[in-house]
């Protein structure tokens, strides 16, 4: 199963860390995607390593563990987050994080 | 640019063991970041996966197979090779070593990038 | 472990008309997958990734789109080579998986 916030606040300028947590007696996690709505953040491979997508990569820092910390947060940031953990033997788990991005006080 | 070459016995007995071997040239399988893969293809009919082994010896098998399967590299010789146990006529096909996922860190995909020529293999008495 | 399902089994197309291809998932792939092409007695050959990016030296002619479970191969005008058998993988999550494949034939 998949445990996360399903909902975070953040400051504009600010950064935020998405994580989900997997949980499993029989699978391994081989590999788990990051996507902001239906666009690409970053994957990382338990083997293969890190990629992050082009575009995200002068803000997205991989980590901590197989979470992601998204820096210099604009309002257009706000929106659904989701992370997919696929695993070995087979197995997909999906996971939702809302973020809001709220105004600098 | 790496290339693959598959080389082995064309032929094996039935319930005898399926030996085959990848050499890879033009890039070193221990500094390498990608998948060395399996795929074989019976004849007149479609592609399946074997197996994969990343350099530092996690491997990833077809469940159908998994039981007969064993895929391992040497880094030393720049090789990684294939057996298959208590092969039958079902095994007879051509072997394709590839590699899997070499543009991963650039593009994010994981795709079977890179393939050899295949080796037929007949499985007769 | 994720079927992957070719349609159809054998295209026939005339030379310089477009041919669409379809593969269907069994479960969600999101937008891993990949396109290949295979000639008589050669290994097949990486065409699309990413569902719809264009490997390094593939024509324009092929484009790939789709995303979750179905996903489509667009040849826009076919050429005598590109008469082959083409397959549709996924990848991530193993076991990888491929599609029965569709032939192209001339009509």
């Known amino acids: 199963t998949i445990d996360t916030k399903r909902n975070i606040s953040a400051e504009e300028g600010g950064s935020v860390i998405l994580q989900c947590h997997f949980s499993s007696d029989t699978a391994e996690v081989t590999q788990v995607d990051w996507k902001q709505q239906d666009q690409l953040l970053a994957i990382y491979s338990v083997d293969l390593g890190w990629h992050v997508a082009s575009v995200f990569s002068d803000r997205v820092v991989p980590g901590p563990s197989l979470g992601l910390t998204f820096q210099s947060l604009t309002m257009n940031d706000t929106g659904e987050y989701f992370c997919t953990y696929h695993t070995y033997p087979g197995g997909i788990y999906k996971g939702r994080i809302f973020l809001k991005v709220q105004e600098s006080s | 640019q790496v290339q693959l070459q598959e080389s082995g016995p064309g032929l094996v007995k039935p319930s005898e063991t399926l030996s085959l071997t990848c050499t890879v040239s033009?890039?070193?399988?221990?500094?390498?970041?990608?998948?060395l893969a399996w795929i074989r293809q019976p004849p007149g009919k479609g592609l399946e996966w074997i197996g994969s082994i990343f350099r530092s010896g996690s491997t990833y098998y077809n469940p159908s197979l998994e039981s007969r399967v064993t895929i391992s590299v040497d880094t030393s010789k720049n090789q990684f090779s294939l057996k298959l146990s208590s092969v039958t006529a079902a095994d007879t096909a051509v072997y394709y070593c590839?590699?899997?996922?070499?543009?991963?860190?650039?593009?994010?995909?994981?795709?079977?990038?890179?393939w050899g020529q295949g080796t037929m293999v007949t499985v007769s008495s | 472990e994720i079927v992957m399902t070719q349609s159809p089994a054998t295209l026939s197309v005339s030379p310089g008309e477009r041919a669409t291809l379809s593969c269907r998932a069994s479960?969600?792939?999101?937008?891993?997958l990949a396109w290949y092409q295979q000639k008589p007695g050669q290994a097949p050959r990486l065409l699309i990734y990413g569902a719809s990016t264009r490997a390094t030296g593939i024509p324009a002619r092929f484009s790939g789109s789709g995303s979750g479970t179905e996903f489509t191969l667009t040849i826009s005008s076919l050429q005598s080579e590109d008469f082959a058998v083409y397959y549709c993988?996924?990848?991530?999550?193993?076991?990888?998986?491929f599609g029965g494949g569709t032939k192209v034939e001339i009509k």
């Open positions: 590839a590699i899997e996922g070499a543009n991963f860190k650039d593009f994010g995909y994981v795709a079977f990038d890179i």
């Open positions: 993988q996924q990848s991530p999550p193993w076991p990888r998986t």
């Open positions: 479960q969600s792939v999101s937008s891993n």
């Open positions: 033009g890039g070193s399988i221990s500094s390498g970041s990608y998948y």
